[in-house]
């Protein structure tokens, strides 16, 4: 997260760290007792590694009573996700067992109504991704409030030049932005999950390259079918 601040500890009990061989790889969001939603591209290079999900965490390194690392029983990338596109960049991870819920571990309601969030709406994005252009990784969860950007502006040639489909949304990126390591994490508007941070090599913090988020409402049928 660029231009953000440290989150209040455990105030986002839905927040997950998707880990590869014990190290933070991507963000994720608990959407059901046994399911974490993240980004499909996160697991592209994870073929031989051990994927786990950390819940109830604020610090990645310090012991915390609510922290627990879960093995992954099943990883379900969206069937249409592809390495070279930002489209359909969703992944559902089934935990090896139902998460132990409590004040620091709780699923987040996700948007089912397929309607765009109004431009200018302030949404919260959180993660353990890099906090500066030098690539410094934080130990504690960071967050930032970002205004939603209308899709037409996001599709301008100087922004994302037509790449933003109706299944994607954008948020402003003027110094405050999600960044590398935040992929798969939640974009929360009015207490509801609206978007998932897309993965990729997008430049962060440049106002002409807005953050891109997968709209969960557009994938309600798929999410429901996997969770069923």
């Amino acid at each position: 997260i660029l231009g953000g601040r440290e989150a209040e500890a455990h105030a986002r009990p839905y927040m997950a760290s998707v880990q590869l061989n014990g190290a933070h790889l991507c963000g994720g969001v608990l959407v059901a007792e046994q399911w974490v939603l993240s980004a499909a591209h996160c697991l592209e290079d994870a073929a031989d590694g051990k994927v786990q999900v950390l819940l109830g965490a604020h610090s990645l390194s310090q012991p915390e009573p609510s922290k627990r690392l879960y093995d992954v029983l099943r990883a379900v990338p969206h069937p249409d996700s592809q390495p070279d596109t930002i489209d359909h960049d969703l992944l559902l991870l089934q935990l090896s067992e139902k998460a132990t819920l409590g004040p620091a571990v709780r699923p987040l309601p996700w948007q089912r109504v397929d309607r765009d969030v109004a431009p200018g709406t302030l949404c919260d994005v959180a993660g353990w991704g890099i906090v500066n252009h030098a690539g410094r990784r934080p130990d504690s969860l960071q967050h930032v409030l970002l205004p939603v950007l209308d899709r037409a502006t996001c599709n301008r040639r100087t922004h994302h030049d037509g790449a933003i489909t109706e299944r994607l949304m954008c948020a402003e990126s003027n110094r405050r932005d999600s960044c590398k390591g935040d992929s798969g994490g939640p974009l929360v508007c009015g207490g509801v999950l609206e978007g998932v941070v897309t993965s990729g090599s997008r430049v962060c913090g440049n106002r002409k390259k807005p953050g891109i988020y997968t709209r969960v409402a557009s994938y309600a049928a798929w999410i429901d079918s996997v969770l069923a």
């Epitope: 431009p119 209308d150 899709r151 037409a152 502006t153 599709n155 301008r156 040639r157 100087t158 994302h160 030049d161 037509g162 790449a163 933003i164 489909t165 109706e166 430049v203 440049n206 002409k208 390259k209």
Partner: antibody, heavy 116, light 112 residues
């Protein structure tokens, strides 16, 4: 299939007005800026300006700002170009073109002839 | 406003020829985001323009590989490696980095 269809061109007297329409189909109208470009007979392409179909924000080439106005009817997925105080030198084919990717999608153009 | 000057204004060539069109801008067209929004369009009589090249050197989908773009800063080139009968048309460069966006005056490619 993305389609842009202009209409409303024709013969108009100097000093007169005309409203051109650009009907869009095959995509979500509010997801892309609409631009207007014109081309005088035997001449090059000239950018008139653009409009954001979500916010209605506009940007005009300074040469056209006082006489030309963009508007929208999102329920009809249509953009409009209102042209006032027309002069002989406004005689041209007028195109609408979607921005994103680049100007990949254009209408067929509509001819406006300003003559007495 | 940024002026784009194309040269030549017109040229005669034969099928199979290699054709080069240049476009010079009156100032740099590198955008504040670091990208250069220099595009090339092809237009045939009575038709709307067609996008060939975007961001200096990227071919738009469906554009034949004989079309290529290059350049940086203020000097840009469109090359047709082996001219085909359907390539006889007018070509325009365009800059989208700075408002107002502008087109070059065009280069007409005619049959020799």
């Amino acid at each position: 299939e993305v389609q842009l269809v202009e209409s409303g061109g024709g013969l108009v007297q100097p000093g007169g007005s005309l409203r051109l329409s650009c009907a869009a189909s095959g995509y979500s109208f509010t997801s892309y800026y609409m631009n207007w470009v014109r081309q005088a007979p035997g001449k090059g392409l000239e950018w008139i300006g653009d409009i954001n179909p979500v916010t209605g924000d506009t940007d005009y080439n300074a040469d056209f700002k006082r006489r030309f106005t963009f508007s929208l009817d999102t329920s009809k997925s249509t953009a409009y170009l209102q042209m006032n105080s027309l002069r002989a030198e406004d005689t041209a084919v007028y195109y609408c073109t979607r921005e994103g990717p680049s100007f990949a999608y254009w209408g067929q153009g509509t001819l406006v002839t300003v003559s007495s | 406003d940024i002026q784009l000057t194309q040269s030549p204004s017109s040229l005669s060539a034969s099928v199979g020829d290699r054709v080069t069109i240049t476009c010079r801008s009156s100032q740099t067209i590198v955008h504040s985001n670091g990208d250069t929004y220099l595009e090339w369009y092809q237009q045939k009589p009575g038709k709307a323009p067609n996008l060939l090249i975007y961001k200096v050197s990227n071919r738009f989908s469906g554009v034949p590989s004989r079309f290529s773009g290059s350049g940086s800063g203020t000097d840009f080139t469109l090359t047709i490696s082996s001219l085909q009968p359907e390539d006889f048309a007018t070509y325009y460069c365009f800059q989208g980095s700075h408002v107002p966006v502008t087109f070059g005056q065009g280069t007409k490619v005619e049959i020799k």
